[in-house]
Interface confidence: low
């Protein structure tokens, strides 16, 4: 038994490391966010016992704007981004985060992913200038691949909306 | 409708480099975590490398580590993937995706792109 995709949380990203019974997973507040004091960040993948389903417990979490991040300004979205060198999951946790509980999501995991249910439309709650969203969902099957093909799904924005396993990610730049 | 188109790939040397880009439309490039994936002949999905909006998370699987770059230009809705020191086992159909991806789970993304890599 697995759980599906987790939810999403506004400003807020998760790269989940395993969809097992138990797993227990931290949501990271974006760059220029911080975890409002008092909240959650975690959730852990339980069984309804009553259902035989399992799903993902609800975090509290709410990401603030850090003030103390303010002065900062985001690259444009223009820039080419690229790195070589992963960073620490430490460099992703703004002030006011809370102790991890259990082993956070490394930058350096193999295999670590957030997801959305297939045939599920991907609807960003916010506009691009305001948050972002990160969505993947479980393996389908696909055409032969070519050298320079192409693959198409339906997308539609929402604003007020959004399916399980879609994460709105805000759009600053460092933390 | 998202649209995802890989290119770059082909045959290569051991030891060799290739860059993989993959042009996006249809959907709010800029927004969204993108991720490259592979999969070896008769092998499964494995994930390569993902990248978040801002490319302040940025993150590689253990069998790259040190010669695939990843990276973005939000301008151009396109993603890359800068593969160095090329070795037989990277041989495989690359795909780029929307999305941080754990192993075998992974969707949408493009219909992929063909590296070979063999002396």
């Known amino acids: 038994i697995t759980c599906p995709p987790p939810m999403s949380v506004e400003h807020a990203d998760i790269w989940v490391k395993s969809y097992s019974l138990y797993s227990r997973e931290r949501y990271i507040c974006n760059s220029g966010f911080k975890r409002k004091a008092g909240t959650s960040s975690l959730t852990e993948c339980v069984l309804n016992k009553a259902t035989n389903v399992a799903h993902w417990t609800t975090p509290s979490l709410k990401c603030i704007r850090d003030p103390a991040l303010v002065h900062q300004r985001p690259a444009p979205p223009s820039t080419v981004t690229t790195a070589g060198v992963t960073p620490q999951p430490e460099s992703l946790s703004p002030s006011g985060k809370e102790p991890a509980a259990s082993s956070p999501s490394s930058n350096n995991t193999a295999a670590t992913t957030a997801a959305i249910v297939p045939g599920s439309q991907l609807m960003p709650s916010k506009s691009p200038s305001t948050g972002t969203t990160e969505i993947s969902s479980h393996e389908s099957s696909h055409g032969t691949p070519s050298q320079t093909t192409a693959k198409n799904w339906e997308l539609t924005a929402s604003a007020s909306h959004q399916p399980p396993g879609v994460y709105p990610q805000g759009h600053s730049d460092t933390t | 409708e998202v649209q995802l188109v890989e290119s770059g790939g082909g045959l290569v040397q051991p030891g060799g480099s290739l860059r993989l880009s993959c042009a996006a439309s249809g959907f709010a490039f800029s927004s969204y975590v993108m991720s490259w994936v592979r999969q070896a002949p008769g092998k499964g999905l494995e994930w390569v490398s993902g990248?978040?909006?801002?490319?302040?998370?940025?993150r590689y699987a253990d069998s790259v580590k040190g010669r695939f770059t990843i990276g973005r230009d939000n301008a151009k809705n396109t993603l890359y993937l800068q593969m160095n020191s090329l070795k037989p086992e990277d041989t495989g159909v690359y795909y780029c995706?929307?999305?941080?991806?754990?192993?075998?789970?992974?969707?949408?993304r493009g219909q992929g792109t063909q590296v070979t890599v063999s002396s």
């Open positions: 995706g929307v999305g941080g991806v754990a192993v075998n789970a992974y969707d949408p």
């Open positions: 990248i978040n909006t801002g490319g302040d998370d940025i």
